[in-house]
Amino acid sequence: FQTFKGLKWDHHNITYWIQNYSEDLPRDMIDDAFARAFAVWGEVAPLTFTRVYGPEADIVIQFGVAEHGDGYPFDGKDGLLAHAFPPGAGVQGDAHFDDDELWSLGKGVVIPTYYGNSNGAPCHFPFTFEGRSYSACTTDGRNDGTPWCSTTADYDKDGKFGFCPSERLYTEHGNGEGKPCVFPFIFEGRSYSACTTKGRSDGYRWCATTANYDQDKLYGFCPTRVDATVVGGNSAGELCVFPFVFLGKQYSSCTSDGRRDGRLWCATTSNFDTDKKWGFCPDQGYSLFLVAAHEFGHALGLDHSSVPEALMYPLYSYLEGFPLNKDDIDGIQYLYGRGSKPDPRPPATTTTEPQPTAPPTMCPTIPPTAYPTVGPTVGPTGAPSPGPTSSPSPGPTGAPSPGPTAPPTAGSSEASTESLSPADNPCNVDVFDAIAEIQGALHFFKDGWYWKFLNHRGSPLQGPFLTARTWPALPATLDSAFEDPQTKRVFFFSGRQMWVYTGKTVLGPRSLDKLGLGPEVTHVSGLLPRRLGKALLFSKGRVWRFDLKSQKVDPQSVIRVDKEFSGVPWNSHDIFQYQDKAYFCHGKFFWRVSFQNEVNKVDHEVNQVDDVGYVTYDLLQCP
């Protein structure tokens, strides 16, 4: 083993902050991978690792791409996977992960399943079905076109399966209440039998959730098929199309036919022979757990090992089981000893404004070969084995609750983008005037303009739009905004005035006096919904119960914010709910809180800060 210039932490209760996330894995899996990676070192040395929610953490964990704010840019897919800094203050000790990698558990993309008989267990790739190997979800054995997968290595033996994310199960956002697509559907007089991007300028695939969009105007966005999104080839980012024809034969899953290197590929149209559009199927990805355990070794003070079997050896290789070699253990115990673990003492969540740390960069831990850019070369022409005749029976077809809405057509009732001063890029905005979830989309208001953020991959940002075009009565500067989840009325606050919009109809401005708020309340920082037509209204460190119907506060209900929401800044300038969490903004940062959505119920176990992040990077997903 080697240590890094003798650098190590001067305390044994190490704290870490997961500053942002990759979209390759569910957040709870990422949290778990990092916790397990720390535990590897905690098992052999007297160290404890406590997750905190702010930049005061010893080890700040970040996903980034290319130039990500330090002097060590990433390099795209493969090559450098991550990097870490030696122990110390500021950026020292931090670990950065290259989000151009495919992060997995080391065995391919992680696809959650729905219904079936596996309780939502992820797909197992590859899996065997009727003697054939599958590395992506398949429609084989089904006549309704719904993709499915086995959740164990052998469906034939175990019979465990689930359905993969698919527009045939559900849609996301839109106004179709999460219902599945109806195929075929009519849009602008034309029939569509698959999701389409027609009528949209942002590339999102959508469908109608009734047979006729022109008539019903109901639609949703089609779920991303991560298992079938190709890389390389000549169609990167497109979806595999199954079945597809290659050399006259039909393929229902990725194949290595026609290639000497054995790599799996697919066509991205239904006929490779005529269209020649193709890409490589997703690979096994890199185990976030293993790479993190390696990086955390660096962050604790270990340099690379010359022992090929050691976790700290500089090349990535996937392995199962406990990853540490004797050389790794000797190294960490040389630095921190082998005594018993100290008592963990979780630090209190900061309530002062966090200072941003320089974004970390990562260096690679492996040098795999780059993807070739040539198409599949003609090879064996043997037909794939016939598809199965039996299939897993479908489960229920209920759908998740709807999310943000946006019309499938490019045009909308909102103003088209016009020049914005000072800057039309929301990623350049230090502090937004107000943020609110309206019609399922997160709205970011600044100086009389706003952007809409739809939470899916790709380019989810729309705008800027002129606020006064959409809500003509409003002033340029807002303090907060809030949509009543029941009535869909939108409340806007600026200074001591309130406006309430029901569709295009406005009531107001009304003085805060009318709400029962005295002259000492100079502005409203935000509202959080409660059940039964109630909300919490915030201003300057205080919170009132607010009746959304009568539009009055209960003057007896006023309490200090920290009595109900511990750990959030008392002087949050914007407070809103998004995806069933409360967000408290101060400066460039937000504090996210899981809270009990019940009137008159305050549960201090629930109203806890569970994340702190940047408004721009983490909510707006700025680069």
């Epitope: 210039k5 330090d70 090559g79 990097h83 950026v91 020292q92 390696h294 340099d303």
Partner: antibody, heavy 124, light 107 residues
Framework: EVQLLESGGGLVQPGGSLRLSCAAS???????DMWWVRQAPGKGLEWVS?????????YYADSVKGRFTISRDNSKNTLYLQMNSLRAEDTAVYYC?????????????????WGQGTLVTVSS | EIVLTQSPATLSLSPGERATLSCRAS??????LAWYQQKPGQAPRLLIY???YRATGIPARFSGSGSGTDFTLTISSLEPEDFAVYYC?????????FGQGTRLEIK
């Protein structure tokens, strides 16, 4: 012993092209970032470009972006700089340099070995 | 990009004296700073990496200190061969940048 030997410099007219080479020996070339740094006559040092070990990532100074291309051949332990659309302000001694850093442990900052340099003169 | 300002531009000292060269960054770069020595007609030579660590083969009279924005290269007792131009270089943020140099000349 670590050695870096540049070649390929010379006199070229504005708008012309040159290809610089840097032959490396004495270390495992394929695992290090490699850099080109230049120095105009009587001036300070200016970074030009960097290439990562596999050649999969390259970065350029704004002043040369779109005109210069860095590449490497790990089987030949050689670094290259293809310079097109040359301008008078590109006149300089061009050095190749080896990064002290290796892999994913950030902190070994500095270029620990440099070539002797090759002079590129752009003039009509 | 981060600007590195070296001072003084020229330093005139005699052999045996102590030399103190300064490098100031326009924003914090933690300890990601290196110092180089360059003699006429030669390539630069790495003296100090990560603000305070001497590179292989560098005599003990050379030392580096500082963190954040202010850094110092100290030569405790000047030898005749130390008279040269000295450059600092940062990698605390992208892109890397060099200082304009300090010329150390014989008084």
């Amino acid at each position: 012993e670590v050695q870096l030997l540049e070649s390929g410099g010379g006199l070229v007219q504005p708008g012309g092209s040159l290809r610089l080479s840097c032959a490396a020996s004495g270390f495992t070339f394929s695992v290090y970032d490699m850099w080109w740094v230049r120095q105009a006559p009587g001036k300070g040092l200016e970074w030009v470009s960097v290439i990562y070990p596999s050649g999969g990532a390259t970065y350029y100074a704004d002043s040369v972006k779109g005109r210069f291309t860095i590449s490497r051949d790990n089987s030949k332990n050689t670094l290259y700089l293809q310079m097109n659309s040359l301008r008078a302000e590109d006149t300089a001694v061009y050095y190749c340099a080896k990064d002290r850093a290796y892999g994913d442990y950030v902190g070994w900052n500095g270029f620990d070995y440099w070539g002797q340099g090759t002079l590129v003169t752009v003039s009509s | 990009e981060i600007v590195l300002t070296q001072s003084p531009a020229t330093l005139s000292l005699s052999p045996g004296e102590r030399a103190t060269l300064s490098c100031r960054a326009s924003q914090s770069i933690s300890s990601f700073l290196a110092w180089y020595q360059q003699k006429p007609g030669q390539a630069p030579r790495l003296l100090i990496y990560d603000a305070s660590y001497r590179a292989t083969g560098i005599p003990a009279r050379f030392s580096g200190s500082g963190s954040g924005t202010d850094f110092t290269l100290t030569i405790s007792s000047l030898e005749p061969e130390d008279f040269a131009v000295y450059y600092c270089q940062q990698r605390g943020n992208w892109p890397i940048t060099f200082g304009q140099g300090t010329r150390l000349e014989i008084k």
